[in-house]
Amino acid sequence: KSEMPQPVSIQDINHRVWVLQDQILIAVPRKDRVSPVTISLISCRHVETLEKDRGNPIYLGLNGLNLCLMCAKAGDQPTLQLKEKDIMDLYNQPEPVKSFLFYHSQSGRNSTFESVAFPGWFIAVSSEGGCPLILTQELGKANTTDFGLTMLF
């Protein structure tokens, strides 16, 4: 099991990268002047207490920024939020902190991130681009839920 967060670069199948804008993550086309965030991911150390067939449960943070991705309800709808949080503090908790956990599933080069707190809801970007990352139940329609991960060392 990993005990240090792994830095990764994430882009979607349309080659859009994640950028932090006013404390919101948005997906924009990769260009010269765009500086994408580096994502840190670390596996939950209580993997045996989570569902086994949905993927690898991970925490997702913004490298060096003490911000982590989490899911919370806004009204009836789960939403994707950034919270000020040290990813290692989440990792070390005595129980899985489900609101901050995602099942990371890989199929070939494509990765999906499903909320542990809200099964069936996936991190997504609108097909239009320049839009905030969201959670969606609609797979492969107006939203892109497939991402490519590149490990950074």
């Epitope: 209580h46 207490t49 989570l50 569902e51 949080k85 908790q93 005595p94 129980e95 902190v97 489900k98």
Partner: antibody
Framework: QVQLVQSGAEVKKPGASVKVSCKAS????????IYWVRQAPGQGLEWIGR????????RYDPKFQGKATLTTDTSTNTAYLELSSLRSEDTAVYYC??????????????WGQGTLVTVSS | QAVVTQEPSLTVSPGGTVTLTCRSS?????????ANWVQEKPGQLFTGLIG???DRAPGVPARFSGSLLGGKAALTLSGAQPEDEADYFC?????????FGGGTKLTVL
């Protein structure tokens, strides 16, 4: 408001089994962890185990592995503790508690009123 | 298995300060033990006070604080009130299981 209401006192004979219920209101048990703890007469608290009602996974103190079984019925928002092969040493008050993450830590924020289980021949 | 030990009883004057401690048989208590403190008042439900060693649970008065002190988990009550008379239990995490202490009966006299 948030409440955990447990079933009533039980008197059992040695070797028998007992099932204690813990009905939650004011929140969905699938959104948290339910812990079970016991207190024998004149003793401190003992952790029995916990269940994640959303997926049914459990953890037990080694001492209670095989003795206690934790389950939930999410349709009725109820958690259960079943104890088998009862002995006089199992006489205790059994508590359920919510163990919830808020802000930056997990807390035991709400407790049931306790269920006295007496094992006597 | 680890044994967690607390003072059986302590007395504090109203308005005074008292520190309850929680010792581990396995050595120094650290933040990795994620100490929890709960309170039991006669005839009332248990109440969670502290989680994660030093984080006060929502709604808990500021006079209660958690810390590490000399290799033990500690609960300090500053400005004790008569209503703080109760039993206090600590619980420490050891990897994937939790161990409670025997409790401290606190008298406010």
């Amino acid at each position: 408001q948030v409440q955990l209401v447990q079933s009533g006192a039980e008197v059992k004979k040695p070797g028998a089994s007992v099932k204690v219920s813990c009905k939650a209101s004011g929140f969905n048990i699938k959104d948290t962890y339910i812990y079970w703890v016991r207190q024998a007469p004149g003793q401190g608290l003992e952790w029995i185990g916990r269940i994640d009602p959303a997926i049914g996974t459990t953890r037990y103190d080694p001492k209670f592995q095989g003795k206690a079984t934790l389950t939930t019925d999410t349709s009725t928002n109820t958690a259960y503790l079943e104890l088998s092969s009862l002995r006089s040493e199992d006489t205790a008050v059994y508590y359920c508690a919510r163990y919830d993450y808020s802000g930056s830590s997990f807390y035991f924020d709400y407790w049931g009123q306790g269920t006295l289980v007496t094992v006597s021949s | 298995q680890a044994v967690v030990t607390q003072e059986p009883s302590l007395t504090v004057s109203p308005g005074g300060t008292v520190t309850l401690t929680c010792r581990s048989s396995t050595g120094a208590v650290t933040t990795s033990n994620y100490a929890n403190w709960v309170q039991e008042k006669p005839g009332q439900l248990f109440t969670g006070l502290i989680g994660g060693t030093n984080d006060r649970a929502p709604g808990v008065p500021a006079r209660f604080s958690g810390s590490l002190l000399g290799g033990k988990a500690a609960l300090t009550l500053s400005g004790a009130q008569p209503e703080d008379e109760a039993d206090y239990f600590c619980a420490l995490w050891y990897s994937n299981h939790l161990v409670f202490g025997g409790g401290t009966k606190l008298t406010v006299l």
